[in-house]
Every structure is written in structure tokens, then in C-alpha cells.
């Protein structure tokens, strides 16, 4: 049909944090590169109907559905979604194409469905259909990568059985220690599944998809390095593959490596050796010990020895189920208002944990760092000196762990007062929890030194939001003090604060704050 316009439908994904429902827009936000949705004419439909390719969107993602119309003259339009019509504001781009956009911010289930765009141009009328659905991430998985030997080749394949299909990369580093951090210039990344260069100092394989990134390090014993001061330990679950690499460098080729489990040599087919000359003409040998699917009896000390190097060993422990070992007893801390302080949890876990820190129903990202002794540590320093309950939660495929912390900030009491017809109450959240005194101000005691002990009731209550303690003191009104000024004072080791209250008939009460350090 000659009269049909040239139409292009695109999807634009946004990195944005606003929240809103679908809205028509002529000028969408800053975006990622547009994705062509095809927009093909739908066959056997009454009228002219174009259909864009189905759009799958993550929950909370922000997108723009956009139509570019190459037709002469003006156009008018209308969006329809779930039988509701939405305003439509076309504009023209630099190539004089009509541009119509629908912005969906923070995608939710209610915003999924069919979006119909009716366009009227001077020449013809037509409809464009977009189907937007929420991506089903419940089926998504991200599994830690594992290694396999490539058939008939001295190479390792990195495999991660994940959905959607992950991007696999090798992360290689040839220097020692700290300089092998992820963003260091010493680190080389190779986005491929097969690795032939297996002589490097540090070899890791990482898999990433929409759920994040998981890495596995090739466990290595280096006979040219002094053994680490704590026993190197490798945990695996029954059925997982075991890979340990032994590496040694010598001035010439006249040396051999062997692997032993406890005191028995590994069977043929459970190891393979590679060697190469380095740039300074020394010989590097590596000997891999591997078991394609471990059983409980593969547990034990694996020792790599050489005819020219001292032996080194690692303990391999095969477990039926994953675990998280840490002390779960709650911990209380008391710090000054400007004191630097971090919560920390030391744990041993396999497989690696996912974790969060929570305070006042708000979750914070959790970082973990491996220690030399096989333990890991997670620290949380971002408490901003807010007192209350902090929760560390960790889990892996097989285990869960929760630990509670209480943070108390040492400070002078601040007093708030309120009164009713029958009583006066004072509140304070200073720490250590304050003690209270009530004093009566009268002609006999203009400095309010006459202490009131009758009818006073003190209590401490947990302010549920933060898990923070608040102390209160209530004075029941008696005839003896009605019409007088009374003073409530809260004091702890850091100071005293007082409030003065006029005990008269009901109504608004004047309070006079009185800070005494």
C-alpha cells in the first residue's frame, strides 16, 4: 500500500530512580541506546495495525516506548491502556519525523499489558500495538562457576549453569597479593569460556547475568612461596568438582611434581601436568589434581611435593550440605558521639554467602573480605552514630545466619515534657539511661531544691523503630503540688538536663527547658 507511512518502533531503557505511573511524554529522559522493536504490519487485521516485538521489562525498571513516523503533514494521536485513554503529545525530530513516546517509570505488575497507540495522519489512520510484560525473574539463577578439563587439550573450561545464560570471563593476575584486586592494572580479563594460559599467579573465573556476578578462584599451591601461616582449606559439597593447582619454578627442567592424598599418590586420570619456560629461561611446571565429582572419601590432606622444593599441603573437606559458622550471640556496644566504630562479623562459610546489614527496616549493602585463616569478615561502619538495633543476615544455598547488635551512643540526656490534668511526664533518650529527680519550686524554695518523692513513677521503654531505649518519669499530681512549678531533671555520667512545668488546670502547659551540663 503506497499510502502507508514508514514507521519505526523503539524501546529505550533508562537508568532512573523516579517513581511514577505510565505517562505520555514528548521529551523522554536521558537513556541507554534504543532497541528496535520491528513494528511489522499485522496480517489479517481489520484496519492498519502494526505490532511491535514483545517487550520484557524488569520490575522497577524505567522504559520509554517510542514511535517514529515518517509521514507528510501533521499527526494526532491517542494512547489507550486497559480501556483508559492517555494523553498523547507528538513532536517532530530533526529529520522531521513525528515522534510519539510513552514513558513508564518504575515498572510494576499493574503497568504490564497492551499499549495501543492510535495515530491519525493526513493520509491515513493506523494503530500500533505494544505488549509489555514483566520479566519472570523467579526462574532466574546464578550459579557459581566451576572448572572442567577440555577434552584432549591442556585447557580449562569455565561453566556456570545459570539462567539467563551468563557472560563468562576469566580474571587473571600475575602479581602477588594486594595488586590482584579487581580493578588493578595487573588484572587481565578475558571474556571467553576456555583458558589455555594456566601458568598465572592468580586465576579466577566469573559468571554474570541479571542477578549479579559470581566468581570461583582456582585453588593454588605455589611451592616457591613460603606456606601461609594458617592451614589452607578448601570446602566442597558432595558431587562438586575438585581442582587444585600446584605450581613450581626452578632454574632448569630437572624436577618433577607429585600430588598425594594423605600418603597415597593420586590415581592416573586425577592429575595432569603442564610446563613452559618463562622469559628468564626458568622452567615453570604446574600439576593439577582434579576429581570430576567429589565423594566424602575425597576429604583429606592433599600434598604437592617436588624433587627441588619443600612440600606444601592443603586440607580438602567434603561436606554433605553448605554451612555458615559464626557466633550468633548478640553484641552490645557503647561509643562516644564522634568515636569511629564498625560492627564486624567473622564467619566461615561454604558456599559463599549473600548478606545484608539492616537498621530501622532499611537494608544496606554488605561487603565481605576473605582473611588468610579461611575465615571471612563483613564490616558495617555506616551507622552515622544512630543508636539502636543493627542486624546482620547471611545466607547461602543451604544455611541462614542472623546476628543482632545494639549500638548505644553515650550522650547527655535531652528532656521533653508533657502534662495532663492528672500527671506530668518527662522523657529522655540519653545514654547511659538517666536517673530522674523531681523538684518543687515555691516561695520557700525559689531555686527549686525541694525534692518530690511521692507519686513518682520511672520506667524505661524500647522505642520500637530503632530499638533504642527511652527513659521516662511520671509525676502523679496531688493537691500539694497543684498550681506550682515543678522541675524534672534527667542525669547521667555525661550531664544533666531539666524541664520546668507549671502544674495548673488542664490546657496547654508552658515548659521551660533548663540545660545544666
Amino acid at each position: 500500500n503506497q499510502d502507508l507511512p514508514v514507521i519505526k518502533c523503539v524501546l529505550i531503557n533508562h537508568k532512573n530512580n523516579d517513581s511514577s505511573v505510565g505517562k505520555s511524554s514528548s521529551y523522554p529522559m536521558v537513556s541507554e541506546s534504543p532497541e528496535d522493536l520491528g513494528c511489522a504490519l499485522r496480517p489479517q487485521s481489520s484496519g492498519t495495525v502494526y505490532e511491535a516485538a514483545a517487550v520484557e521489562v524488569d520490575v522497577s525498571a524505567s522504559i520509554t516506548l517510542q514511535v517514529l513516523v515518517d509521514a507528510p503533514g501533521n499527526i494526532s494521536c491517542l494512547w489507550v491502556f486497559k480501556h483508559s485513554s492517555l494523553n498523547c503529545q507528538p513532536h517532530f525530530d530533526l529529520q522531521n519525523r513525528g515522534v510519539v513516546s510513552m514513558v513508564i517509570l518504575k515498572m510494576t505488575e499493574t503497568q504490564a499489558g497492551e499499549y495501543l497507540l492510535f495515530i491519525q495522519s493526513e493520509a491515513t489512520n493506523y494503530t500500533i500495538l505494544f505488549t509489555v510484560s514483566i520479566r519472570n525473574t523467579l526462574l532466574y539463577t546464578l550459579r557459581r562457576p566451576y572448572f572442567r578439563k577440555m577434552e584432549n587439550q591442556d585447557a580449562l573450561v569455565c561453566i556456570s549453569e545459570s539462567v539467563p545464560e551468563p557472560i563468562v570471563e576469566w580474571v587473571l593476575c600475575d602479581s602477588q597479593g594486594e595488586s590482584c584486586k579487581e580493578e588493578s592494572p595487573a588484572v587481565v580479563k578475558k571474556e571467553e569460556k576456555v583458558l589455555h594460559e594456566l601458568f598465572g599467579t592468580d586465576i579466577r573465573c566469573c559468571a554474570r547475568n541479571e542477578l549479579g556476578r559470581e566468581c570461583t578462584r582456582l585453588f593454588t599451591i605455589d611451592l616457591n612461596q613460603t606456606p601461609q601461616t594458617t592451614l589452607p582449606q578448601l570446602f566442597l559439597k558432595v558431587g562438586e568438582p575438585l581442582w587444585i593447582r600446584c605450581k613450581a619454578v626452578h632454574v632448569n627442567h630437572g624436577f618433577g611434581l607429585t600430588w598425594e592424598l594423605e600418603n597415597k599418590a593420586l590415581e592416573e586420570g586425577n592429575y595432569f601436568e603442564m610446563s613452559t619456560y618463562s622469559t628468564n629461561r626458568t622452567m615453570i611446571r604446574i600439576l593439577f589434581a582434579f576429581v570430576s565429582s567429589v565423594a566424602r572419601n575425597d576429604t583429606g590432606y592433599y600434598t604437592c611435593s617436588s624433587s627441588k622444593h619443600p612440600s606444601q599441603s592443603a586440607l580438602v573437606t567434603i561436606v554433605e550440605k553448605g554451612f555458615i559458622n559464626a557466633t550468633n550471640s548478640s553484641e552490645d556496644y557503647e561509643i562516644d558521639q564522634y568515636e569511629e566504630f564498625c560492627f564486624s562479623v567473622r564467619f566461615k562459610a561454604y558456599p559463599q554467602i549473600r548478606c545484608t546489614w539492616t537498621f530501622s527496616r532499611k537494608s544496606f549493602p554488605c561487603e565481605q573480605k576473605g582473611l588468610d585463616n579461611g575465615y571471612s569478615i563483613s564490616k558495617f561502619c555506616n551507622h552515622k552514630h544512630q543508636p539502636g538495633e543493627y542486624i546482620f543476615h547471611a545466607e547461602n544455598d543451604d544455611a541462614q545466619f542472623t546476628k543482632m547488635f545494639t549500638l548505644n551512643i553515650r550522650r547527655k540526656p535531652q528532656v521533653l515534657a508533657e502534662a495532663s490534668a492528672s500527671q506530668a511526664s518527662c522523657f529522655s533518650d540519653g545514654y547511659p539511661l538517666p536517673s530522674w529527680t523531681w523538684k518543687k519550686c515555691s516561695d520557700k524554695s525559689p531555686n527549686c531544691t525541694e525534692e518530690i518523692t511521692e507519686g513518682v513513677w520511672n520506667r524505661k521503654a524500647n522505642r520500637k523503630v530503632f530499638g533504642q531505649w527511652v527513659s521516662s518519669s511520671t509525676l502523679n499530681m496531688s493537691e500539694a503540688i497543684k498550681g506550682f512549678l515543678v522541675k524534672c531533671c534527667a542525669y547521667n555520667s555525661l550531664g544533666t538536663s531539666c524541664e520546668t512545668i507549671l502544674l495548673n488546670s488542664p490546657g496547654p502547659f508552658p515548659f521551660i527547658q533548663d540545660n545544666i551540663s
Epitope: 606456606p227 592451614l231 589452607p232 618433577g256 607429585t258 594423605e262 600418603n263 590432606y301 600434598t303 611435593s305 617436588s306 624433587s307 627441588k308 622444593h309 619443600p310 612440600s311 606444601q312 599441603s313 592443603a314 586440607l315
Partner: nanobody, 110 residues
Amino acid sequence: QVQLQQSGGGLVQAGGSLRLSCAASGIFKTNYMAWYRQAPGKQRELVAAFTNDGSTLYGDSVKGRFTISRDDAKYTVSLQMNSLKPEDTAVYYCYGLGHWGQGTQVIVSS
């Protein structure tokens, strides 16, 4: 459970001798064992070890002066240190199967 129990060590005059011993339990072969040392402010370094063909290895600075030996029946490894020098002053550690002994102080006075 692997345990390494060290004995010997102490204070000795330069030129003198000392003998260190390391008794192992839970270890299957004494040729897995070695001696390392750590001087104040320095990295731990190899002193002497056995290799997988039964021969011995020595750190460059102790060759010809120190001798490593083993008693397979008693699962004991010893280090005989002769012609000691002040620079041999260090804490000496026995190593085997990924585990370390408790460390033995050797002080060589001039």
C-alpha cells in the same frame, strides 16, 4: 588431627651449636616436613626441608652448617645447627601438612 611439638632452642654463643626437634602426630610421612625461620621484621624463610625423592634442601644462608634429619619410626624431624652466627637469631618453625609448630626462639650472641 595434625600436631607439631617443637623442642630445643635457646641462647648460644656465636660459633656454637644447637639442636631443634619436632615431634609430629597425625602426619603420614616425615618427608612432608620442613624447617622455616622468621627474624624480627623479616618474612618467614626456608631453612631446610625434604623433597619428594628423599633428598634434602637448604636455604642459601645455612648450607654446609645446618643438617635436617628424620626418624620415621618416631615421626620426628630434627635440625642440627652448627657454626651459628648472630644472623641466625630468629624464631624457628617446624612445618608439615599445612600446619606449623609453636615456634622456638634461637638467640645467637656475639
